[in-house]
Every structure is written in structure tokens, then in C-alpha cells.
Interface confidence: medium
């Protein structure tokens, strides 16, 4: 028996289902008495769902997940995993016995899209030209971890001085904050990127400070 | 008929590690699930996990995740439990049982397994 | 876990007599494939544990009829009519619905 998936990792939002495909080809008068199917965690070997016996075996891993019984039969072994967490990111093998077995593996990546910047300077009041001011670019509920970029408002990369920190919440989702230390000019704009690696989303924020008061762009 | 052989008795110093062995026999191993149940003198059975001989795949009771490791040779239809970091709250009779996933008909006459200095 | 709650903790019988025990899970043991996975084991003294009852009501081959088992959802029962003097040591029942896989406490049946 040869057990095919996709050799493209599978990419899931969290709290979305993701299907892991697998697939086998039965040979003529194949019955689903004969099936052994398995799939588990690749690393750990933790068991996820079975078939075996002629029957479903359920889920082992938090009653999250489902094989697709109807079409068992005609080879397909994928498994539906629901309500995509964070933690379930990693390697799973589809291991399909017959008379003699096959086994492959799958990668499902996870993501979340993070939220629009809020962006915050201090101080942010009796701003004068040449001030040191800070501003501070805030991001939420992303996953995996954000790439971050500040620009001026000539699109100049500004790369000196800026520290992002990174923390992960009980969910392992990232609130991103990334601040930029700068000497204020005459008036200038300093735009913040956020940018997901993952579904190449990107989020924007921005503010403009023009002598007084500051302003902030309206939202997109 | 099914059997599932296992040493009668273990004696290990705390700290230790050891790794107790079920011989199955009288049936094909790879078509058995087979899982770990440990009793304690006096006391109800606790399982512990299974694993499935052709995959290797395994299912742990989180009581036991740190605490044992399911393993199985199948050129010797062999499965076997490694506990480590033993204590005195390890010594137990360890039994192994062959069936589903979801049931378990045959059992070993299990280890006795004795944790003291 | 689902926590399996057996009583009596001691069931003192005379040989001939009826036994009744008692299995009450913490939550349904209907399985999402619709089985329900409550087996009834006899323990006797030195010895593994013994198959008597699987899926709450099927006897396991060998097994005498004067065994039956009853139930459903959280609430089971083992009987055993004219009890002889092999059917004494510790029943446990078990489900194996929910990982983790859990026992009850176990029921002595003993001469009274």
C-alpha cells in the first residue's frame, strides 16, 4: 500500500479547521475490516486518531478531530482537525496497514493575522524640534512571531534605536510592541510595518506630528 | 491461545531506572494494541498508556507522561514500560494487556516491582 | 478523568445467593461511534485481572451466563445469580471511552 500527502505544509488560521491530507490506494474488493489506519504526532508518536477493527477508534488527542468516514473506503484517510490551536503546529504521519503498510507525514502550520497597530509617543505634549520622543507601535493576537519595520515619511528604513519585544499569551498568540527613540525634525511622519511571515499580512500604523498638535492618520 | 509473559518480580534502588518486558505469544503482535496498568498493593488499577506495535504510536495517561516510556521490539514480540526517577510510591505489580485501542482482553500476570535501598 | 465510583466497597455473600454491584461513572461513556466501552473484570488473589464483561452487557467467551451486565450512560450493574465459590475476589469495573482509561475502586465479594 503507498500513502500519499501533500509535501506543502498545510497552513491554518487558529479557531479555523484544518484538513491534513492523506490518501492510499485500495486494490480491488477492499473492505474496511481489512483498514488499519493511525494517525499520530510524528516526533512524539502521540497517538491522534484511529481507525482499526473495522471501525473508528475516535480521537486521543483533546476531541478535536475527525476522519472523513464516507470516504474511507475509496482512500481517503485525511483527518480533520478542529478548532486549530497553537500548540497543534508540528509533524503528523499517516500510517495505513493493509496487508502490508505505508506511512507519510504532514506539516501543518499555524498563523494568526495581527491586529492593526496602535501607536502611542511620549511625551505627547509641548513637542518641540529636536525633543527626543518615544513611540510606541502595538500589535496583537499574531502567531507565528512578527518581522517589524519603522520608516520615516520618505519610506526611509529607520533602524537605529528601536527595541521590539515579543510575548506570547496563554493562547502562545504574540502581542507585539516595538518602540522608536528619535530626535523630532521641523514635523514628520513615522510609519510602523508589522508583518506576518507566514501569510504575508501586513499591518500598518502611523503618526504624523506637525508642530501642534500631533495628529494620527485616520483608520484605513 | 494468547499469552503474554512478564518477569515475576523486579527489585530497584531509588532513583533508578527500569524497564519492564511483555512477551507476547499465540496471536500476531502487530494486530494488538498493548497497554500498561499498574496496581498498587491493596489499591485500584491505574492505567498508564498503550502503544501500537506496527506504528510505535502511543497514548499516555498525563499521570504517567514523565514517568514511563512504552516501547516494543517486534522482532521479539516483545513490548516493554521504562519507568525512571523511581520511588517508593513505584512499587507496584505492572501488568501488560493485549487488545483494541479501546479494550484490553488479555493480560500478563505482571511484574511486581519493588523500589527500595 | 472520568472518576468510576463502584459500591459496595464489600459485597458478603452466601454461595447460592444473588450479588449486585454497582458502576456509576463521573460522565456519559457513550463513545462518538456510539459503543459504550464498560467492561466488568474478576481479580482474584495473586492473579491479573479477568475479562468477565465488555461493551456493559456482552459476556466474554467462556464466561458463565449466571454473569450479566445492565446500564447505560453513567449508570452500570454487574449481577451475579447463584454465586459459586470461584466467583469470590475483587470485581473493578472500567471504562475506556475517555483517555485517560479509568477503574473503579473495586468490590469484594466475599462469603458472608
Known amino acids: 500500500v503507498e500513502v500519499q500527502v501533500s509535501e506543502d505544509p498545510v497552513v491554518a488560521l487558529v479557531d479555523t479547521d484544518a484538513t491534513l491530507r492523506c490518501s492510499f490506494s485500495p486494490e480491488p474488493g477492499f473492505s474496511l475490516a481489512q483498514l488499519n489506519l493511525i494517525w499520530q504526532l510524528t516526533d512524539t508518536k502521540q497517538l491522534v486518531h484511529s481507525f482499526t477493527e473495522g471501525r473508528d477508534q475516535g480521537s486521543a488527542y483533546s476531541n478535536r478531530t475527525a476522519l472523513f468516514p464516507d470516504l474511507l473506503v475509496q482512500g481517503n484517510a485525511s483527518l480533520r482537525l478542529q478548532r486549530v490551536r497553537v500548540t497543534d503546529e508540528g509533524s503528523y504521519t499517516c500510517f495505513v496497514s493493509i496487508q502490508d503498510f505505508d506511512s507519510a507525514a504532514v506539516s501543518l502550520q499555524v498563523a494568526a493575522p495581527y491586529s492593526k497597530p496602535s501607536m502611542t509617543l511620549e511625551p505627547n505634549k509641548d513637542l518641540r524640534p529636536g525633543n527626543m520622543v518615544t513611540i510606541t507601535c502595538s500589535s496583537y493576537q499574531g502567531y507565528p512571531e512578527a518581522e517589524v519595520f519603522w520608516k520615516d515619511g520618505q519610506g526611509v528604513p529607520l533602524t537605529g534605536n528601536v527595541t521590539t519585544s515579543q510575548m506570547a499569551n496563554e493562547r502562545g498568540l504574540f502581542d507585539v510592541h516595538s518602540v522608536l527613540r528619535v530626535v523630532l525634525g521641523a514635523n514628520g511622519t513615522y510609519s510602523c510595518l508589522v508583518r506576518n511571515p507566514v501569510l504575508q499580512q501586513d499591518a500598518h500604523g502611523s503618526v504624523t506630528i506637525t508642530g501642534q498638535p500631533l495628529t494620527f492618520p485616520p483608520e484605513a | 491461545q494468547v499469552q503474554l509473559q512478564q518477569p515475576g518480580a523486579e527489585l530497584v534502588k531509588p532513583g533508578a531506572s527500569v524497564k519492564l518486558s511483555c512477551k507476547a505469544s499465540?496471536?500476531?503482535?502487530?494486530?494488538?494494541?498493548m497497554h500498561w496498568v499498574k496496581q498498587r498493593p491493596g489499591q485500584g488499577l491505574e492505567w498508564i498508556g498503550l502503544?501500537?506495535?506496527?506504528?510505535?504510536?502511543?497514548n499516555y495517561n498525563e499521570m504517567f507522561k514523565n514517568k514511563a516510556t512504552l516501547t516494543v521490539d517486534r522482532s521479539s514480540s516483545t513490548a516493554y514500560v521504562q519507568l525512571s526517577s523511581l520511588t517508593s510510591e513505584d512499587s507496584a505489580v505492572y501488568f501488560c494487556?493485549?487488545?483494541?485501542?479501546?479494550?484490553?482482553?488479555?493480560w500478563g500476570q505482571g511484574t511486581t516491582l519493588t523500589v527500595s535501598s | 478523568d472520568v472518576v468510576m465510583t463502584q459500591t459496595p466497597l464489600s459485597l458478603p455473600v452466601s454461595l447460592g445467593d444473588q450479588a449486585s454491584i454497582s458502576c456509576r461513572s463521573s460522565q456519559s461513556l457513550v463513545h462518538s461511534n456510539g459503543d459504550t466501552y464498560l467492561r466488568w473484570y474478576l481479580q482474584k488473589p495473586g492473579q491479573s485481572p479477568k475479562l468477565l464483561i465488555y461493551k456493559v452487557s456482552n459476556r466474554f467467551s467462556g464466561v458463565p451466563d449466571r454473569f450479566s451486565g445492565s446500564g447505560s450512560g453513567t449508570d452500570f450493574t454487574l449481577k451475579i445469580t447463584r454465586v459459586e465459590a470461584e466467583d469470590l475476589g475483587v470485581y473493578f469495573c472500567s471504562q475506556s471511552t475517555h483517555v485517560p482509561y479509568t477503574f473503579g475502586g473495586g468490590t469484594k465479594l466475599e462469603i458472608k
Open positions: 502503544i501500537h506495535p506496527d506504528s510505535g504510536s502511543t
Open positions: 494487556a493485549g487488545g483494541g485501542r479501546l479494550y484490553f482482553d488479555y
Open positions: 499465540g496471536y500476531t503482535f502487530s494486530s494488538y494494541w
